[in-house]
Amino acid sequence: EKSDLRTVAPASSLNVRFDSRTMNLSWDCQENTTFSKCFLTDKKNRVVEPRLSNNECSCTFREICLHEGVTFEVHVNTSQRGFQQKLLYPNSGREGTAAQNFSCFIYNADLMNCTWARGPTAPRDVQYFLYIRNSKRRREIRCPYYIQDSGTHVGCHLDNLSGLTSRNYFLVNGTSREIGIQFFDSLLDTKKIERFNPPSNVTVRCNTTHCLVRWKQPRTYQKLSYLDFQYQLDVHRKNTQPGTENLLINVSGDLENRYNFPSSEPRAKHSVKIRAADVRILNWSSWSEAIEFGSDDG
């Protein structure tokens, strides 16, 4: 994206430049360099200092957002003298024109929706564009299908998530014929934005004394194994008084997901439904379809 880059430098400049596509800050190499460092300072005065690249005339910033504006700084010492240079990276354009209320979620294991709202001061002809880069910065994904509101892009639907990694950089650029539009950027973890489907293949089998519930873990976008899941079972006796508490049972994921509970014959009509979550986050899926067992005259 185009953004004003203003350099604050002494007479003999390092010619500091920043490529927002690769997040790479580079400068002119100096002979007999004894020390060099680069860092950025954001609007909240937080400092981020990445490792220098091997050639020591560039550095790459990984986990950073730029929409609030940042200042890059390079310090280089040579055997003769010291150099210092600042590079201001503002979010140019009219204040309040950037996309806002940006959020994304992954669903059905391989689909993603991102949505945003137009900036409050954005002109009528504003158009927004979404770009996604994975943490390895190897490829950029342009939004393939936009969701529109009166011709303005206010969301994006992706049905191919193969280019994503566990952490991804989202950039919403804006254009207008009238004024400059600010950009919005965000870093999102796929594990935090995935909404699981409920467990599948839920079955209940009962004998004279017990009932056994079995289910399969949901298919997910993240590569998760069985211990990464937590389940909740809602075993519910039908036709009970309103306000009667349901029995919620927590079950850790296993290779064979099952829950065996005492229930002797004759048993009243019950229903069971199950939901799933990532054990680390407990972002619960919706409930599975209720499965009924027992009889009305139990």
Partner: antibody, heavy 120, light 111 residues
Framework: QVQLVQSGAEVKKPGASVKVSCKVS????????IHWVRQAPGKGLEWMGG????????VYAQRFQGRVTMTEDTSTDTAYMELSSLRSEDTAVYYC?????????????WGQGTMVTVSS | QSVLTQPPSVSGAPGQRVTISCTGS?????????VSWYQQLPGTAPKLLIY???KRPSGVPDRFSGSKSGTSASLAITGLQAEDEADYYC???????????FGGGTKLTVL
């Protein structure tokens, strides 16, 4: 019940290669991820490699890079670990294990182990 | 030399409580990556006791518990029994070596 059954003990000469198999029963290999861990006699556990979901490929511990190859035959639900240019320090029990958790790196269950002896 | 440090041995009388420590660094346990614990009885394969720092897989008695704080983790065993005599290993992930790592192991003796 999911089980991992490994191939029998092997005796190899220095410089040779060994290929250990790990057969999955009670589940299909495509639904699982296998990692390999070894244990020298009287010593601790050492991770060798396995499927990494972040990279979406099999990754190897640095010290085995170039000497180890891990493969899978999904038609027979069998995983293989081949170690080449064997030396006496490679004498160990080699285990395959199912990754029970990616986020927490936890292995369950394990194969029974395959003893590989490297001796001239 | 293991990246995760465990005491070589601990001991306790039947019925007692013992803890086994596992000390790492900012590139593994403190990163923060989760810790798992294994029990290895003589001549058998390791068995998972604890995962995600403090969760027990099905079939593991609640006498075993795990905790984590900063760059260290620990395994506690209460109501010690003769059959608990085994080697115990902690495990985590290390971002500097980009690999799964194990502690050197702790031999538990039931007196």
């Amino acid at each position: 019940q999911v089980q991992l059954v490994q191939s029998g003990a092997e005796v190899k000469k220095p410089g040779a290669s060994v290929k250990v198999s790990c057969k999955v029963s009670g589940y299909t290999l495509t639904e699982l991820s296998i990692h390999w861990v070894r244990q020298a006699p009287g010593k601790g556990l050492e991770w060798m490699g396995g499927f990494d979901p972040e990279e979406n490929e099999i990754v190897y511990a640095q010290r085995f890079q170039g000497r180890v190859t891990m493969t899978e035959d999904t038609s027979t639900d069998t995983a293989y670990m081949e170690l080449s240019s064997l030396r006496s320090e490679d004498t160990a029990v080699y285990y395959c294990a199912i990754v029970g958790s990616f986020s927490g790196i936890a292995y369950r269950p394990w194969g029974q182990g395959t003893m590989v002896t490297v001796s001239s | 030399q293991s990246v995760l440090t465990q005491p070589p041995s601990v001991s306790g009388a039947p019925g007692q409580r013992v803890t086994i420590s596992c000390t790492g660094s900012g590139s593994n346990i403190g990163a923060p990556y989760d810790v798992s614990w294994y029990q290895q009885l003589p001549g058998t394969a390791p068995k998972l006791l604890i995962y995600h720092n403090n969760k027990r897989p099905s079939g593991v008695p609640d006498r075993f518990s795990g905790s984590k704080s900063g760059t260290s983790a620990s395994l506690a065993i209460t109501g010690l029994q003769a059959e608990d005599e085994a080697d115990y290993y902690c495990q985590s992930y290390d971002s500097s070596s980009i690999s799964t790592i194990f502690g050197g192991g702790t031999k538990l003796t039931v007196l």
